[in-house]
């Protein structure tokens, strides 16, 4: 791992209890095509192990959803951010579903060792746990 | 290519016959800004030449489409998967258009030499062949 | 920078005057989480400093937007392209908002030193300047 090739791709494990908007992730070859090479999971949240600029990407699909479902339950919003340490807490990427059932995006952002990324899904719709519909990952790009 | 910088970006060539949901791709400098450095095309499908973790990305736009078009012809779905060898067949990434005319996403996934990726567009709408609206690519990220 | 790790992530500064559809970008640690390592800004437009294949990505969210807003003001379209030198002018990536308020996509494309990328937002809606909703970046991938 000394080359700095830190990379992770996670699949959805479960949603949090009612007052917790966070999505809880899991990863590892035994689960399918998810993996962690460098970063680690801390209670379902992704923790960074190497300083650098990362490409963060996510796709979330709402379960048993149609455009009418999405619009009836609007607003449903997904935000990816650094949730700890508290001193570095910030929203990195935010999208609303509006009349769609899937959001997907990506961005480059500096992350530091110890940063924990949270993915907050606000609204009343459950996300799909299908591994080809909902996933979250990071890729170390440069120091 | 020994550095493992395998990368490809493809443009839509054509759709398949009626019972074949696959999109057929083409690439090469003579066609515009598409290219293959490492991976190859096998009858319009992308074949991987180097084991590793890849960033797979795709954008597909439906031809002469408006939000009303998209909803009238729903459901239209795009799935990217490994279609051969059959033993490794799996859906990697899936999106529905709902009331939109474009889907775009990306994910990290392990791929092996010989894996052939297929992009299946189910539904009854022709995709746009404009090279800035419909494209498909992979980028080797790490071993 | 000799390794070719050119990378940039920009945040929206402002839109152009009425006849200018370009978005004007800004970047730098003092502004938040945006940065330029290699590429430069020329009057708010991103200029490439190193030949190679780049991953270009963008997300644009319309300000104070709902699906009804978006559909009422349709068509709103975002195009990313090389705008100079004129001899290399081309559209690289194009998306319409339809009934959504956010577009996000990415693609691999060859860029050359001196290429200036423009992001044209056509329509009558203002984009959000929130740094987690609207951003634009490039990442050098290979020679």
């Amino acid at each position: 791992e000394s080359l700095g090739w830190d990379v992770a791709e996670l699949q959805l494990n479960h949603t949090g209890p009612q007052q917790d908007p966070r999505l809880y992730w899991q990863g590892g070859p035994a689960l399918g095509r998810s993996f962690l090479h460098g970063p680690e999971l801390d209670k379902g949240q992704l923790r960074i192990h190497r300083d650098g600029i990362y490409m963060v990407h996510i796709q979330v699909t709402l379960a048993i959803c149609s455009s009418t479902t999405a619009s009836r339950h609007h607003p449903t919003t997904l935000a990816v951010g650094i949730c700890s340490p508290a001193s570095r807490s910030i929203s990195l990427l935010r999208l609303s579903f509006h009349q769609g059932c899937t959001i997907a995006s990506q961005r480059l952002t500096p992350l530091a060792r110890g940063d924990t990324l949270c993915t907050n899904l606000t609204g009343t719709l459950l996300p799909s746990r299908n591994t080809d519909e909902t996933f979250f990952g990071v890729q170390w790009v440069r120091p | 290519e020994s550095l493992g910088w395998d990368v490809a970006e493809l443009q839509l060539n054509h759709t398949g016959p009626q019972q074949d949901p696959r999109l057929y791709w083409q690439g090469g400098p003579a066609l515009g800004r598409s290219f293959l450095h490492g991976p190859e095309l096998d009858k319009g499908q992308l074949r991987i030449h180097r084991d590793g973790i890849y960033m797979v990305h795709i954008q597909v736009t439906l031809a002469i489409c408006s939000s009303t078009t998209a909803s009238r012809h729903h459901p239209t779905t795009l799935a990217v998967g490994i279609c051969s060898p059959a033993s490794r067949s799996i859906s990697l990434l899936r999106l529905s258009f709902h009331q939109g005319c474009t889907i775009a996403s990306q994910r990290l996934t392990p791929l092996a030499r010989g894996d052939t990726l297929c992009t299946n567009l189910t539904g009854t709408l022709l995709p746009s062949r404009n090279t800035d609206e419909t494209f498909f690519g992979v980028q080797w990220v790490r071993p | 920078e000799s390794l070719g790790w050119d990378v940039a992530e920009l945040q929206l500064n402002h839109t152009g005057p009425q006849q200018d559809p370009r978005l004007y970008w800004q970047g730098g640690p003092a502004l938040g989480r945006s940065f330029l390592h290699g590429p430069e800004l020329d009057k708010g437009q991103l200029r490439i400093h190193r030949d190679g294949i780049y991953m270009v990505h963008i997300q644009v969210t319309l300000a104070i937007c709902s699906s009804t807003t978006a559909s009422r003001h349709h068509p709103t379209t975002l195009a990313v392209g090389i705008c100079s030198p004129a001899s290399r002018s081309i559209s690289l990536l194009r998306l319409s908002f339809h009934q959504g308020c956010t577009i996000a996509s990415q693609r691999l494309t060859p860029l050359a030193r001196g290429d200036t990328l423009c992001t044209n937002l056509t329509g009558t809606l203002l984009p959000s300047r929130n740094t987690d909703e609207t951003f634009f970046g490039v990442q050098w991938v290979r020679p």
Partner: antibody, heavy 120, light 111 residues
């Protein structure tokens, strides 16, 4: 094989309605759209409207106020109804299948046509 | 609505020769990497028959002597070599937007 069979009256009184049924075989209305087109010596071929596989309809703006297209997927039937006919609505009315691709908006198989005369 | 103008209104072509029919659109019918123009053949007392779709694609079962070309606003249907059974009226139709419209037709007579 693919067939579209039309049935309907040949003569309609002015200001009355025209109803035509198009019964299809060899394909499913849950998969294919059906267009309606008319042909008259004065106006040539005119597209009137379409019912998509989803059951949603689109009409030519010139006829939207008096045209209705519906279907019964289980019976493989498409129903065409035009109100307030006048003499210039005298024409041959065709139903026609849209090809597999919905946004192609062409017509690959046609009914035999229903010749309609509007006269008292 | 897009207006399609066909020319000539009629033409007579000797058996085995080439027939060329033109169709001009009032605005471009090319979009999304395709050309949304189709050609039909209609014989007296029959419904139209699709010959060519998307400007140049031959519909299944249509003889290869039929070919279509063009993009933007100007289109051509060629028949070569012309056969007796090709005597008919030919129509162009666009589907760039709703409503689709048809040309006025070109009547082909075989000499």
């Amino acid at each position: 094989q693919v067939q579209l069979q039309q049935s309907g009256p040949g003569l309609v009184q002015p200001s009355q309605s025209l109803s035509i049924t198009c019964t299809v075989s060899g394909f499913s209305l849950t998969t294919y759209a059906v267009h309606w087109v008319r042909q008259s010596p004065g106006k040539g071929l005119e597209w009137l409207g379409v019912i998509w596989s989803t059951g949603i309809t689109d009409y030519n703006a010139a006829f939207i106020s008096r045209l209705s297209i519906s279907k019964d997927n289980s019976k493989s039937q498409v129903f065409f109804k035009m109100d307030s006919l006048q003499s210039d609505d005298t024409a041959i009315y065709f139903c026609a299948r849209n090809p597999h691709y919905g946004n192609l908006n062409a017509m690959d198989y046609w009914g035999q046509g229903t010749s309609v005369t509007v006269s008292s | 609505d897009i207006v399609l103008t066909q020319s000539p209104a009629s033409l007579a072509v000797s058996l085995g020769q080439r027939a060329t029919i033109s169709c001009r659109a009032s605005k471009s019918v090319s979009a999304s990497g395709y050309t949304w123009m189709h050609w039909y053949q209609q014989k007296p007392g029959q419904a139209p028959k699709l010959l060519i779709y998307l400007a140049s694609n031959l519909e299944s079962g249509v003889p290869a002597r039929f070919s279509g070309s063009g993009s933007g606003t100007d289109f051509t249907l060629n028949i070569h070599p012309v056969e007796e059974e090709d005597a008919a009226t030919y129509y162009c139709q666009h589907s760039r937007e709703l409503p689709p419209t048809f040309g006025g037709g070109t009547k082909l007579e075989i000499k």
